[in-house]
Interface confidence: low
């Protein structure tokens, strides 16, 4: 039962994270939550950083600054793969949830 619950939590978290990405950066509250998650867990996007390419409100050559290894204003614009966290947040935060929830 515990595993089923954990999988459900992961699935819900994945869906919720992707929904929040769709609202980025239009919704300031959503943006701050995602930015905090990405910066704290050193991750970018749901599955990986390329998820941001699919977000209509984000220009194609951009990820949130919170994806950067060294976060500075505008660092996500014209980013280079070496300068950002490439690992997805769902797996990374999910691992933390599995250990702590």
């Amino acid at each position: 039962a515990g595993y089923v619950f954990r999988d459900k939590v992961m699935s819900e978290f994945n869906n919720n994270f992707r929904q929040q990405m769709e609202n980025y950066p239009k919704n300031n509250h959503t943006a701050s939550i995602l930015d905090r998650m990405q910066a704290d867990f050193k991750c970018c996007g749901a599955a990986n950083y390329t998820d941001w390419e699919k977000i209509p409100s984000m220009s194609k050559n951009r990820v949130p600054d919170s994806c950067c290894i060294n976060v500075t204003v505008g660092c996500g614009i014209n980013f280079n793969e070496k300068a950002i966290h490439k690992e997805g947040c769902v797996e990374k935060i999910g691992g933390w949830l599995r250990k702590n929830v």
């Epitope: 220009s59 194609k60 014209n78 280079n80 070496k82």
Partner: antibody, heavy 117, light 108 residues
Framework: QVQLQESGPGLVKPSETLSLTCTVS????????WNWIRQSPGKGLEWIGY??????NYNPSLRSRVTISEDTSKNQFSLKMSSVTAADTAVYYC????????????WGQGTMVTVSS | EIVLTQSPGTLSLSPGERATLSCRAS???????LAWYQQKPGQAPRLLIY???SRATGIPDRFSGSGSGTDFTLTISRLEPEDFAVYYC?????????FGQGTKVEIK
């Protein structure tokens, strides 16, 4: 695979406006940064500017004379340079800036523009 | 603007030899935003290296890039006949984006 093709007059008179078009095939102009770069014997390779979803960035040395715009319906972007002189004689390239690498990963073959009366 | 100075202007080498090309910036460039291009006569430049050391798609592993700050290097480990060309470095971290003046690698 994205391909780029420049087109426009090869000869422009001094003080007139240079107009070039770059046609994008194999990809949407709605993605990426679309650049103009020129190469002359005197100045080497010189970045002119880019357009990205109608937002632009120009080289300050050319900004007062340059307009880069895009036509999404035709999947094209264009360069207009006013008040040209002989110093603007060069090979003009259009180039795509890639997602994740951000260098100029795809180039057109270039078009020679001569400014002369 | 950031001025990129390439050296030497011309490099005369034989096929099979190692080529080392230098690019020096007038101010610090993030290594994430330094590229190298190859250009042959009558052709457009071709991207070789981006992010100072990442090879572009389809570029053979004899091409490698390194460096940080103001000093960057392009190395061709063993020159093939098709490698004789002009090589340019370029920075795209600070607008306006700028190119070096080029290094010509010619057959000795």
């Amino acid at each position: 695979q994205v391909q780029l093709q420049e087109s426009g007059p090869g000869l422009v008179k001094p003080s007139e406006t240079l107009s070039l078009t770059c046609t994008v095939s194999g990809g949407s102009i709605s993605s990426y940064y679309w650049n103009w770069i020129r190469q002359s014997p005197g100045k080497g390779l010189e970045w002119i500017g880019y357009t990205k979803k109608r937002s632009t960035n120009y080289n300050p040395s050319l900004r007062s004379r340059v307009t880069i715009s895009e036509d999404t319906s035709k999947n094209q972007f264009s360069l207009k340079m006013s008040s040209v002189t002989a110093a603007d004689t060069a090979v003009y390239y259009c180039a795509k800036m890639g997602w994740g690498s951000h260098a100029f990963d795809i180039w057109g073959q270039g078009t020679m523009v001569t400014v002369s009366s | 603007e950031i001025v990129l100075t390439q050296s030497p202007g011309t490099l005369s080498l034989s096929p099979g030899e190692r080529a080392t090309l230098s690019c020096r910036a007038s101010q610090s460039v993030s290594s994430s935003y330094l590229a190298w291009y190859q250009q042959k006569p009558g052709q457009a430049p071709r991207l070789l290296i981006y992010g100072a050391s990442s090879r572009a798609t389809g570029i053979p592993d004899r091409f490698s890039g390194s460096g940080s700050g103001t000093d960057f290097t392009l190395t061709i480990s063993r020159l093939e006949p098709e490698d004789f060309a002009v090589y340019y470095c370029q920075q795209y971290g600070s607008s306006p984006w700028t190119f070096g003046q080029g290094t010509k690698v010619e057959i000795k």
